[in-house]
Interface confidence: low
């Protein structure tokens, strides 16, 4: 399948529009601080070059790898050293080290201004004036803020973004039409980015085997009627797609994802009965739909797992002959029978099974040794079930905002060294598990909750990795991918933490809080709550609740006052004094 010119091959496969969009995403994900215009110029140069290679694959430099071509182009940026510092040193390296170097400098939390949404009329004018630039700008702004965003999926978001403006900018009430659609895309985009970030972390930090295990479990739940060989083929192809995207090989990734969607749709009879609707859609929608498709019904009368994996006398023989294939079959068979389990739980069970076989197949009587292996699964299954039950009860009692606050206190006490913005962001997201998952019947709670928590805790891990401050976070993040959530759950209050010095400035508020949205106001209050816990880690729930209630009353009072700023200054001093007294500071 070798091509004389890789760049020509991808240009022809993807078409000019997708080629340009993907190159822009790739460049923006690497050079996150570069101005839009600089990226557009680079993309246009690459596109013109690709066209010369399409015309003549033997033309000069057309035989170079995409990493070489793109890396050379990125290294022409004049301000590389002053903007990016040591990242400029990457340009002294040869491929593939140069690309690895660029990847290592991707920043999960770039110092970029928050995206402020202009007035609807302003956006519609910009859209009509230059639709192409408007959409490119969307790709650029998302890609630079989310350097691991799944590129082919970002094309799907851009298509929906365009459709929203096309429809709404000619509606009678543009804002009523457009704003909910943009909110929807923003929320879905954040969720999509976080899910993909976990896939990349899984591949990059724990390796291909870890990712493949995850994929076997998830695809077996989703396609329980598919045979093991079919699931294995899909896993291999899916791993290639995500390895490419996570590695910055976005053209190859998008091309291979399209091929995978084509294969799935051509073979849906042997994969899943739920794919029909997805497969009637255009490419981007089709791929998205397949990725989100609901689980197929389990085949009737599946035999007991024990026969092949416990009772059979050939267990050790089969395991010894091909360990990963046998474990893969175990995972496949267990997962297809258990759509009610989270993927991470299924992986814990497979790990327990593997550990047992490693020990028992070397024992005098292997069968006697592993006969009770399924009994070891019971506590592993019950732990997340009990945790979800307890937390859903708490969520139903408190509601989302107060549930988030409970988690803020819990996690600040566990890892108080973590920065306040990170604790607020992560705890708010952890708290959303309540409204996302607790309303579901028992059979659907665990896959919803625990797999969502894996995504959120990965956000904590990647943010913490940039500036490590807590050995406990590092330990939970690096020891085991599938045990991250149990590791964080098991953390108690950090007794070694020295409380932060009290700083009145942290608790000084101004009238601008009154004009904030409800969400932003919540974040302000939650930021104050984290700071309180950092000052007084031993504060009781009742003490913290009293201070937070006072704080809410203070904000409400001053926002109703005629002279808001004076109220915030005077009442704020009283609040700080009262809070210090309440907490014994």
């Amino acid at each position: 399948d070798a091509h004389k010119s890789e760049v020509a091959h991808r240009f022809k496969d993807l078409g000019e529009e997708n080629f340009k969009a993907l190159v822009l995403i790739a460049f923006a994900q690497y050079l996150q601080q570069c101005p839009f215009e600089d990226h557009v110029k680079l993309v246009n140069e690459v596109t013109e070059f690709a066209k010369t290679c399409v015309a003549d694959e033997s033309a000069e430099n057309c035989d170079k790898s995409l990493h070489t071509l793109f890396g050379d182009k990125l290294c022409t940026v004049a301000t590389l050293r002053e903007t990016y510092g040591e990242m400029a040193d990457c340009c002294a390296k040869q491929e593939p080290e140069r690309n690895e170097c660029f990847l290592q400098h991707k920043d999960d939390n770039p110092n970029l201004p928050r995206l402020v949404r202009p007035e609807v009329d302003v956006m519609c004018t910009a859209f009509h004036d230059n639709e192409e630039t408007f959409l490119k700008k969307y790709l650029y702004e998302i890609a630079r803020r989310h350097p691991y965003f799944y590129a082919p999926e970002l094309l799907f978001f851009a298509k929906r973004y365009k459709a929203a403006f096309t429809e709404c900018c000619q509606a009678a009430d543009k804002a009523a039409c457009l704003l909910p659609k943009l909110d929807e895309l923003r929320d879905e985009g954040k969720a999509s980015s976080a899910k993909q970030r976990l896939k990349c972390a899984s591949l990059q930090k724990f390796g291909e085997r870890a990712f493949k295990a995850w994929a076997v479990a998830r695809l077996s739940q989703r396609f329980p009627k598919a045979e093991f060989a079919e699931v294995s083929k899909l896993v291999t192809d899916l791993t290639k797609v995500h390895t490419e995207c996570c590695h910055g090989d976005l053209l190859e990734c998008a091309d291979d994802r399209a091929d995978l969607a084509k294969y799935i749709c051509e073979n849906q009879d042997s994969i899943s009965s739920k794919l029909k609707e997805c497969c009637e859609k255009p490419l981007l929608e089709k791929s998205h739909c397949i990725a989100e498709v609901e689980n197929d019904e389990m085949p009737a009368d599946l035999p007991s797992l024990a026969a092949d994996f416990v009772e059979s006398k050939d267990v050790c023989k089969n395991y010894a002959e091909a360990k990963d294939v046998f474990l893969g079959m175990f995972l496949y068979e267990y997962a297809r029978r258990h759509p009610d389990y989270s993927v991470v739980l299924l992986l814990r069970l497979a790990k327990t099974y593997e550990t047992t076989l490693e020990k028992c197949c070397a024992a005098a009587d292997p069968h006697e040794c592993y006969a009770k292996v399924f009994d070891e699964f019971k506590p592993l299954v019950e732990e997340p079930q009990n945790l979800i039950k307890q937390n859903c009860e708490l969520f139903e009692q408190l509601g989302e905002y107060k549930f988030q606050n409970a988690l803020l206190v819990r996690y600040t006490k566990k890892v108080p060294q973590v920065s306040t913005p990170t604790l607020v962001e992560v705890s708010r997201n952890l708290g959303k598990v309540g409204s996302k998952c607790c309303k579901h019947p028992e059979a659907k709670r665990m896959p919803c909750a625990e797999d969502y928590l894996s995504v959120v805790l990965n956000q904590l891990c990647v943010l913490h990795e940039k500036t490590p401050v807590s050995d406990r976070v590092t330990k939970c993040c690096t020891e085991s991918l599938v045990n991250r959530r149990p590791c964080f759950s098991a953390l108690e209050v950090d007794e070694t933490y020295v409380p932060k010095e009290f700083n009145a400035e942290t608790f000084t508020f101004h009238a601008d809080i009154c004009t904030l949205s409800e969400k932003e106001r919540q974040i302000k209050k939650q930021t104050a709550l984290v700071e309180l816990v950092k000052h007084k880690p031993k504060a009781t729930k009742e003490q913290l609740k009293a201070v937070m209630d006072d704080f809410a009353a203070f904000v409400e009072k001053c926002c109703k006052a005629d002279d808001k700023e004076t109220c915030f200054a005077e009442e704020g001093k009283k609040l700080v004094a009262a809070s210090q007294a309440a907490l014994g500071l």
């Epitope: 929906r160 909910p180 929807e184 609901e294």
Partner: nanobody, 123 residues
């Protein structure tokens, strides 16, 4: 407290029409995708239709395409299900549900549920 209250169910002859409504309170309605599910006696609950937060995206199960129409009024915090050419197999308890994100199929993507309204189609 979040409440989803369905209304409009009843008994109708095959070939007839019904319009179900679902009034939402206690949530920011325009921030939620909405869906209608149904559960016939002795059967699993199945998604019938759903509509995205802005109303720009809709989903219909094969069994109702061309007969049912979902719409929403964000100003009134209400989602509607217009059911035409009803068949006896449409008989079920119809539930309204709300999802934080555009929900692509899994029941567990829906965060809030109504109590249901009964639709009985006689032949």
């Amino acid at each position: 407290d979040v409440q989803l209250v369905e209304s409009g169910g009843g008994v109708v002859q095959a070939g007839g029409s019904l319009r179900l409504s679902c009034a939402a309170s206690g949530l920011t309605f325009s921030s939620y995708a909405m869906g209608w599910f149904r559960q016939a006696p002795g059967k699993e609950r199945e998604r019938v239709v759903s509509i995205s937060r802005g109303g720009g995206y809709t989903y219909y199960a094969d069994s109702v395409k061309g007969r049912f129409t979902i719409s929403r009024d964000n100003a009134e915090n209400t989602v509607y299900l217009q059911m035409n050419s009803l068949k006896p197999e449409d008989t079920a308890l119809y539930y309204c549900a709300a999802a934080r994100y555009w929900a692509t199929g899994s029941e567990y993507e829906f965060d809030y549920w109504g109590q249901g309204t009964l639709v009985k189609v006689s032949s």
